[in-house]
């Protein structure tokens, strides 16, 4: 028995304890945010702790319950939506998850005027998507891949589309690849601002190859899940956009919106739709080779009853150094004249900035500039533009909210958040009411998250919406790890890193090092945000140093870093992790015999390649749900960064960049490979192929599969996963259990 002398002497610090794995798995130290559900310039809805739906009026200070928890409970509702005319509420229950964003649910319509559920012409079930019109109480919904319209909740539905078919034709909802890699939504229909028109996408997946995998369930025979899923180079969905007049939909029928000629000449994608007015719509299109994007502004011609998209209103965005946009092509934010707009794209120095486009992209006026990036435009009013950037103090992993006065000349810029709670808050997002009369700021860290309400004219803080007091109190007796964000300068490349250090960190001692990596194109891991998670526990309780490094290919530091990985995934991301590890060793407190790397998804790919790099740096590592070959992953994502897997394009690098090609190099590392068998995103096939290659090379490794689990490995699998990985790392680092 070894008696350790107490590290602390005063009685208060004696009560301090390290984080436990149980704390993490139970979510003991999770935080809350408050996003108002804005319903006007000065009113918002919020679901109270006891599940009442409460309407708050900022100006009168009054609040009242518009829907009681009793009504919510009567249909087991987990979500709600108030109609813009405030006459009805939809209640959502029987939530059933499909993919990342999509789910089906049962919907009930509650009439607020008489306090009863609407009877007659009830909605079918389960519904794939449902939404109110922006004005009044029309309903659009998707059922069995077809779109329906109700003029009023109690009315019979008008069926807009009829060709919807499971896994074949999707109307008003995206197919798998559009949901995951292009739209990032569960819906593909858009109301015009006053509800006159409804635009929708039709995705035809008839010719797409199908991924099939077993779902074991509890039955005697497993089910087979079939998903039309275009892998790199495969046939893609065919998309068409239609607009229907919702006032008299039976008369003219859906009008197809023309695709710009320069886009339609080869395979293409639809990337987003933005309504400008009831009679003007903006569509964005993208060539399959994703370095050319076209923004097309279309006008409704009353006399022709058609949508006209003149060539003079086509704006081309092209990248010569990489792909168009960041992760996605940015969307326009239109100004009050309903023709000019603000948009984020690369400036001549290769930094993403806000530009104002009045006639042509060539004549765009640059609104922001500098060796930092504008990240999101939140709102444009008649006199202000609100946006977020990482400009402040030159930390790429921060987010502050800025206001530019566009009503005055020259425009003046003000940082709204930079000095509010400087130590606690360096990473913000915002949510604006109509006309930006008020806004909520949500601070994610590095301190404990806090949500506040502000006046849109003066930026004055009105009240705290959520400050996580309970979390703050719960953490008072916890020995949290220390965190630092710094940078390494290596061969003209800046590598920002976050280091998570044990509470009693001593620079003169040696610590095991765990690298947590994601590293995917346009991602960012080094962010000034609060988190109490698995790696916090590893530092707090197990005494590990954890490092996250943003290398080449990551976002918000300019195109040179971002597009460095173009057409050669799996090279520089890995090199930069290795370079950083070498720098960390030089710092003197890392035990170079105990270095590990782990990652999930793209991070699993990078960690696998790092382990197989032959450097001898890593003793062990974990890959969770890794990509193993880019030929196995989705076309939209993969081809954006890699081009096509054809001989005359980039097949050679597709082949060179596989994990399987490096099977021999795993011989001298301890490798834990983990995957869910029902992963719809990164298919189990990826890990199956790694395992096969390792077996064929007679290389020993460890593996764990999670039956019927998807890419998220949720529920009880999460507990099992982190427990299993903890054991693996402790064994690797010779830490006692």
């Amino acid at each position: 028995i070894v008696l350790r002398p107490s590290r602390v002497h005063n009685s208060e610090e004696n009560t301090m304890r390290a984080l436990t794995l149980k704390d993490i798995l139970n979510g003991t130290f999770s935080y809350k945010t408050f996003f108002p559900n804005w319903i006007s310039g000065q009113e918002y809805l919020h679901q109270s702790a006891d599940n009442n739906i409460v309407l708050y009026n900022i100006e009168t200070g009054q609040s009242y319950t518009i829907l009681s928890n009793r009504t919510m409970k009567s249909v087991n509702a987990s979500n709600y939506g108030l109609s813009p005319d405030r006459q009805f509420v939809y209640l959502e229950s029987d939530y059933s998850k499909l993919w990342r964003y999509s789910y089906t649910a049962t919907y009930y319509i509650y009439d607020l005027s008489n306090g009863e559920f609407v009877r007659g012409n009830e909605l079918p079930r389960p519904i794939q998507y449902l939404c109110w019109s922006p004005v009044g109480s029309k309903l659009a919904y998707v059922y069995q891949n077809n779109i329906y319209l109700k003029q009023r909740p109690g009315d019979p539905p008008f069926q807009i589309t009829f060709n919807g078919r499971e896994n074949k034709i999707f109307n008003g909802i995206p197919d798998w690849v559009y949901e995951e890699e292009m739209l990032a939504t569960k819906y593909a229909l858009w109301w015009s601002p006053n509800g006159k028109f409804l635009a929708y996408a039709e995705f035809n997946d008839t010719d797409i190859p199908v991924i099939a995998y077993s779902y074991y369930g509890d039955e005697q025979y497993p089910r087979t899940i079939n998903i039309p899923y275009p892998k790199a180079g495969a046939k893609n969905p065919v998309v068409r956009i239609f607009i229907i007049d919702t006032t008299y939909p039976a008369y003219v029928g859906p009008q197809e919106v023309p695709v710009p000629a320069m886009i339609a000449s080869s395979d293409y994608y639809f990337s987003w739709l933005t309504w400008v007015t009831d009679e003007r719509v903006c569509l964005q299109w993208l060539k399959r080779v994703q370095n050319v994007s076209v923004l097309s502004i279309c006008d409704f011609r009353e006399d022709w009853q058609t949508w006209d998209c003149p060539k003079t209103q086509e704006h081309i965005e092209e990248s010569r150094t990489g792909w168009a946009g960041g992760f996605f092509v940015s969307t326009p934010v239109f100004s009050y004249d309903a023709i000019s707009y603000y948009k984020i794209f690369s400036d001549k120095d290769g930094y993403k900035h806000i530009h104002y486009i009045k006639d042509t992209v060539e004549n765009a006026i640059q609104i922001t500039s500098g060796k930092w990036e504008a990240i999101n435009i939140f709102r444009v009013t008649q006199d202000s533009l609100f946006y977020s950037s990482n400009e402040f103090e030159e930390y790429p992993g921060r987010r502050n909210i800025y206001r530019i006065s566009i009503g005055s000349y020259p425009p003046s810029k003000k940082c709204v958040t930079c000095h509010l709670r400087k130590e606690r808050c360096q990473y913000y997002t915002a949510s604006f009411s109509d006309y930006a009369k008020y806004y909520a700021l949500v601070c994610y860290g590095p301190g404990i998250p806090i949500s506040t309400l502000h006046d849109g004219r003066t930026d004055q803080e009105i009240k705290i919406l959520e400050e996580n007091k309970e979390l703050e109190n719960a953490l008072k007796n916890i020995q949290l790890p220390k965190e630092e964000i710094k940078k390494l300068e290596v061969d003209e490349i800046t590598l920002w890193y976050k280091m998570i250090l044990p509470p009693q960190f001593d620079r003169s001692k040696k610590y095991p090092l765990l690298i947590q990596v994601y590293g995917g194109p346009c991602s960012q891991s080094v962010r000034s945000v609060f988190a109490v998670n698995w790696i916090s526990y590893l530092a707090s309780k197990e005494g590990m140093v954890i490092a996250l490094v943003d290398g080449r290919g990551t976002a918000f530091q300019g195109d040179k870093l971002l597009y460095a990985v173009y057409r050669k995934l799996g090279v520089y991301e890995v090199e930069d992790q290795i370079t950083a590890v070498r720098k960390f060793i030089e710092m003197g407190f890392i035990d170079e015999k105990r270095i590990a790397i782990w990652g999930w998804s793209y991070g699993g790919y990078v960690s696998s390649l790092a382990l197989a790099s032959g450097t001898g740096l890593f003793k062990c590592g974990i890959a969770v749900a890794p990509v193993s070959s880019w030929e196995y992953y989705a076309s939209v994502y993969t081809e954006r960064f890699m081009g096509l897997p054809t001989k005359d394009d980039n097949l050679e690098h597709y082949k060179n960049s596989t994990v399987m090609a490096r099977a021999e190099y795993f011989r001298n590392v301890d490798y834990l490979l983990i995957h869910g068998t029902a992963d719809d995103n990164v298919h189990f096939q990826n890990s199956a192929q790694i395992a096969k290659a390792l077996v064929n090379a007679q290389v020993d490794f460890q593996a764990m599969w999670y039956s019927d689990q998807n890419h998220g490995l949720s529920g009880l699998s999460t507990n099992h996963l982190y427990t299993h990985m903890t054991h693996f790392l402790k064994q690797c680092f010779s830490l006692s259990d």
């Epitope: 007659g120 012409n121 003029q151 009315d155 019979p156 539905p157 008008f158 069926q159 589309t161 009829f162 060709n163 068409r240 239609f242 006032t247 008299y248 939909p249 039976a250 008369y251 003219v252 029928g253 859906p254 009008q255 197809e256 011609r301 006399d303 022709w304 009853q305 058609t306």
Partner: antibody
Framework: EVQLLESGGGLVQPGGSLRLSCAAS????????MSWVRQAPGKGLEWVSG????????YYADSVKGDFTISRDNSGNTLYLQMNSLRAEDTAVYYC??????????WGQGTLVTVSS | EIVLTQSPGTLSLSPGERATLSCRAS???????LAWYQQKPGQAPRLLIN???RRATGIPDRFSGSGSGTDFTLTISRLEPEDFAVYYC?????????FGQGTKVEIK
């Protein structure tokens, strides 16, 4: 002035084929959904088929599905109905009408199709 | 499909009288999707009341449409000689669009 003019009707034997045409003028043809509606002698009206302005979506009554094909030539401002495997019960006056599912605000004068041996 | 039943089958009235034609749907339609047509012998139908109870272009205001749900009415306030014809209601809310069997308005 909007005008719709059908042609192509006539006498045909059971199992035979006919192609009806509808020449449109006086409006932007390519912008509008068009339909075919028929009327058997002494009977009421029956919707047969509809097509949207771009030609990208078509629908049919169950009674003609698989045998009839609606199409349009927007450059020539013409609507078509290809009728195959004709039966005696297809005998009717065939009208082309401007509209999708309802509110057919302009009609042609009709063309008579007689299916008889 | 939605079945539309018109009544009466025949309506015998004199010029100047008021005509009330009924159309009943087998399921709810709403006025947004119901239209009325007039057809004279040897002629094509003519749209009278467009979807949404709006009079079609050039239709005199003696014609009006009303109703909701499953029960709809076409009213001709004062019959003119040229109004004697067959009248059809038609629904466009559900595929296939369907017509009523017609009401014949004849001179008494």
């Amino acid at each position: 002035e909007v005008q719709l003019l059908e042609s192509g009707g006539g006498l045909v034997q059971p199992g035979g084929s006919l192609r009806l045409s509808c020449a449109a003028s006086g409006f932007t043809f390519s912008s509008y959904a068009m339909s075919w509606v028929r009327q058997a002698p002494g009977k009421g009206l029956e919707w047969v088929s509809g097509i949207i302005g771009s030609g990208g979506i078509t629908y049919y009554a169950d009674s003609v599905k698989g045998d009839f094909t609606i199409s349009r030539d927007n450059s020539g401002n013409t609507l078509y109905l290809q009728m195959n495997s004709l039966r005696a019960e297809d005998t009717a006056v065939y009208y082309c009408a401007k509209g999708w599912f309802g509110g057919f605000n302009y009609w042609g004068q009709g063309t008579l199709v007689t299916v008889s041996s | 499909e939605i079945v539309l039943t018109q009544s009466p089958g025949t309506l015998s009235l004199s010029p100047g009288e008021r005509a009330t034609l009924s159309c009943r749907a087998s399921q709810s339609v709403t006025s947004s999707y119901l239209a009325w047509y007039q057809q004279k012998p040897g002629q094509a139908p003519r749209l009278l009341i467009n979807v949404g109870s709006r009079r079609a272009t050039g239709i005199p205001d003696r014609f009006s449409g009303s109703g909701s749900g499953t029960d709809f009415t076409l009213t001709i306030s004062r019959l003119e000689p040229e109004d004697f014809a067959v009248y059809y209601c038609q629904q466009g809310i559900m595929l296939p669009p369907t017509f009523g069997q017609g009401t014949k308005v004849e001179i008494k």
